[in-house]
């Protein structure tokens, strides 16, 4: 969590005489009690007693797993990728049986030359990682291959990868139109059949921080939301401070319940505080409000 909430504790004495400290916080959450061996612990909300303490499940914490965290760790991948399945027809190489065998010298040489050619074609695309030949077949050489793209995760990663796939299409179309055989000879590193270029399929990494946040928040899914800071997503409840969605409890403490975030107002030596945001103070000695 980005912030820790101090919890006052009450001492309970177990039947064996040992003392267990449990947070004395009133929270309307479902309660399940985990009993392991002789050790009876009040591990609520699916938490379990490991012999020393309650091991809580997300999104709970506290000595009895009775409190809801203010933020949940969500970890987007550092990089996201796209894979484009393409087919091109190379006319400057005649198909031979050796090309079927991926461990043959011929295949290795073809793979090296094809990779060099594609590296030239796609130079200038920052997301371009490389190509991977999946199959070679007759006609002259029909090259089934994957173009691999990768970029740093940002909230706009899909747009970046979609744009990159469009540039790949443009560049492969251009090269297979321009680098063609003349008089049965090719002057380029490789020549192509213009009509043999096809994009079969495009697969883009799917990552949705909102979905991950909702899944991890479980029954609190409606109250946790994703906010970005420095392009990094944070899964927060309104009780997490420092975000646009943060709830200001003024003279009180924010606490999550199954009905959402609420403010628990404090009473000081001089004032009672009330109101939804604990912003209405009543002086104890003089009974008038001031805002």
């Amino acid at each position: 969590p980005l912030a820790t909430i101090p919890v006052s504790t009450t001492s309970l004495t177990s039947s064996e005489g040992s003392t267990i400290s449990t947070p004395s916080v009133d929270i309307s959450t479902p309660v399940t009690t985990s009993i392991v061996g002789d050790q009876c612990s009040r591990c609520k909300n699916g938490g379990f007693w490991d012999g020393l303490k309650c091991q809580c499940l997300t999104p709970y914490y506290g000595e009895s797993c009775e409190e809801v965290v203010n933020s949940i760790d969500i970890a987007p991948p550092e990089t996201v990728s796209a894979q484009m399945e393409l087919t091109v027809t190379v006319t400057s190489v005649k198909f031979t049986d050796e090309l079927k065998n991926h461990s043959s010298q011929e295949f290795r040489e073809f793979n090296k030359t094809f990779t060099e050619q594609m590296n030239i074609v796609y130079s200038g695309i920052p997301e371009y990682v490389g190509v991977n030949i999946t199959n070679l077949r007759l006609g002259s050489v029909v090259v089934e291959h994957d173009v691999l793209l990768r970029t740093k995760y940002t909230p706009e990663y899909k747009t970046a990868l979609d744009n990159a796939t469009e540039v790949v299409k443009q560049k492969i179309t251009k090269v297979t139109t321009e680098q063609i055989m003349t008089n049965d000879n090719c002057s380029a590193l490789m020549c192509f059949n213009t009509t043999g270029t096809q994009v079969q399929n495009i697969t883009v990494t799917q990552y949705d921080p909102v979905e991950e946040c909702r899944q991890k928040a479980e029954e609190y899914e409606d109250y946790f939301l994703v906010e970005y800071r420095d392009q990094k997503p944070y899964c927060i409840s309104p009780c997490e401070s420092g975000f646009n969605a943060s709830k200001n409890c003024n003279h009180g403490k924010c606490q999550m319940s199954q009905n959402g975030a609420r403010c628990l107002c404090v009473t000081t030596e001089t004032h009672w505080y009330s109101g939804e945001d604990c912003n209405q103070g009543t002086q104890k000695s003089h009974h008038h409000h001031h805002h």
Epitope: S92, V93, K94, E98, E106, F110, T113, S187, A188, L189
Partner: nanobody
């Protein structure tokens, strides 16, 4: 490991002849493509003549009818018979090879190269 050794270069008068040879070791002689390239001082390497495993040949326009490429698979040797030589044929001649059946005159497509043999044609 493929190794190519070119020889047969020399100095000749315009109109004369030379026969270049290239001994290939570690190269499956019945497969792929063998070629001759040349490079004149200050110029790019250019394809001169090409021969495929099935005997298909192709030539640069500038040497057609004057140069003949051939290969002996049994001897793993490549030849270039050069007749009616001209001063513009002067340069370093290299033999090159690929395990692939290539139809490209681009030097970058050929991974295996011999050291050059110098041909000088004076007028």
């Amino acid at each position: 490991d493929v190794q190519l050794q070119a020889s047969g270069g020399g100095s000749v008068q315009s109109g004369g002849s030379l026969r270049l040879s290239c001994a290939a070791s570690g190269f499956p002689s019945s497969r792929g493509t063998m070629a001759w390239f040349r490079q004149a001082p200050g110029r790019e390497r250019e394809g001169v003549a090409f021969i495929n495993s099935d005997g298909r040949t192709s030539y640069a326009e500038s040497v057609k009818g004057r140069f003949t490429i051939s290969r002996d698979n049994a001897l793993s040797t490549l030849w270039l018979q050069m007749n009616s030589l001209k001063p513009e044929d002067t340069g370093m001649y290299y033999c090159a090879a690929s395990l692939l059946y290539l139809m490209t005159v681009n030097a970058a497509a050929y991974p295996y190269w011999g050291q050059g043999t110098q041909v000088t044609v004076s007028s």
